[in-house]
């Protein structure tokens, strides 16, 4: 099948890093500078991504693969392939229309990115607040008041769960 296809379409023989040049009798020509083809049989090469401004180059463009960008310090990636850079804030803050602002009372953010989330409502689970929440930390829920008898040992606060939202895709 491959041989049949290559007889029908000479471009299918062109490997990654080249393109099938219609202006030169469909011979395989290397991709020009600042362009690439990641698969064989392509009739054009794609322009390399340029990492400018708040973007910085994580991986240089080659003839067979696009450049990869990340963000300069003080910013973090958003979107597939780091399509956007978003400003970092401090813990206890979130990025708003007017820049980094403290979390409103009753909400917290324990990271330099993301949004302020409401404190856990311990009473919904029939528990009491063991440690009050802050702008940077969620409340820690303990046993229900009825469970706390004199001399009962205090509950060790659980380690906070990792905030979702930082895995690819």
């Amino acid at each position: 099948f491959e041989r049949t296809r290559s007889l029908q379409d000479p471009c299918s023989n062109c490997p990654a890093g080249t393109f099938c040049d219609n202006n030169r009798n469909q011979i395989c020509s290397p991709c020009p500078p600042n362009s690439f083809s990641s698969a064989g049989g392509q009739r054009t090469c794609d322009i390399c991504r340029q990492c400018k401004g708040v973007f910085r180059t994580r991986k240089e463009c080659s003839s067979t693969s696009n450049a990869e960008c990340d963000c300069t310090p003080g910013f973090h990636c958003l979107g597939a392939g780091c399509s956007m850079c978003e400003q970092d804030c401090k813990q206890g803050q979130e990025l708003t229309k007017k820049g980094c602002k403290d979390c409103c009372f009753g909400t917290f953010n324990d990271q330099k990115r993301g949004i302020c989330r409401p404190w856990t409502n311990c009473s919904l689970d029939g528990k009491s607040v063991l440690v009050n929440g802050t702008k940077e930390r969620d409340v820690v829920c303990g046993p229900s008041p009825a469970d706390l008898s004199p001399g009962a040992s205090s509950v060790t606060p659980p380690a906070p769960a990792r905030e979702p939202g930082h895995s690819p895709q």
């Epitope: 958003l78 956007m84 229309k97 409103c104 993301g114 979702p164």
Partner: antibody, heavy 120, light 107 residues
């Protein structure tokens, strides 16, 4: 590709409970908050709450507190929304939607929706 | 809880520009995201993070913001843009609210 597939339509009697499932695929399930939104016939969208699939933590809209429970099973990448003490005005299409990551929260993608009909 | 107000209905001539607005106190702090919903279908995200479009959303859709009002603009409206449009934002307590919805008719 990222996809959310919900369970099928349900018919319930007033006072009963309903549990709707939302199976996620194409991404790391524990990496993104999941929200639930409902839409009554001919009406607008109404936010119900979210679950953090990593920790199981939840936040419910005040209107639904005491009646809604959001849970998840990370082993099968599925989120659940259970609504109890159903009334006729709970008849609606219920959607799950994944929260995007960023300073501006957004919902993408959405499940196809589950019609819950409450009728005696 | 905070509210987001939209015009119930807006119409636009084919190929013309239309602006759909969303007004609310929370929009002084947060940007809205925008959703398109066609009859019998789930909502689809069209604008997020100020003025970003998900892949597959045409560049005739754009977002803007001023004071307590965010706007969705469709430049050169097409017949397939006829739908309901909803804005969404968080409030200061960390909850979410949808706008009342705008029915767009393309004439």
């Amino acid at each position: 590709q990222v996809q959310l597939v919900q369970s099928g339509a349900e018919v319930k009697k007033p006072g009963a409970s309903v549990k709707v499932s939302c199976k996620a695929s194409g991404y790391t399930f524990t990496g993104y908050y999941m929200h639930w939104v409902r839409q009554a016939p001919g009406q607008g969208l109404e936010w119900m709450g979210w679950i953090n699939p990593n920790s199981g933590g939840t936040n419910y809209a005040q209107k639904f507190q005491g009646r809604v429970t959001m849970t998840r099973d990370t082993s099968i990448s599925t989120a659940y929304m259970e609504l109890s003490r159903l009334r006729s005005d709970d008849t609606a299409v219920y959607y799950c939607a994944r929260e995007g990551v960023g300073a501006t929260s957004w919902f993408d993608p959405w499940g196809q929706g589950t019609l819950v009909t409450v009728s005696s | 809880s905070s509210e987001l107000t939209q015009d119930p209905a807006v119409s636009v001539a084919l190929g013309q520009t239309v602006r759909i607005t969303c007004q609310g106190d929370s929009l002084r702090r947060y940007h809205a995201s925008w959703y398109q919903q066609k009859p019998g279908q789930a909502p689809v995200l069209v604008i997020y993070n100020k003025n970003n479009r998900p892949s597959g959303i045409p560049d005739r859709f754009s977002g803007s913001s001023s004071g307590n009002t965010d706007s969705l603009t469709i430049t050169g409206a097409q017949a397939e843009d006829e739908a309901d449009y909803y804005c969404n934002s968080r409030d200061s307590s960390g909850n979410y609210v949808f706008g009342t919805g705008t029915k767009l008719t393309v004439l």
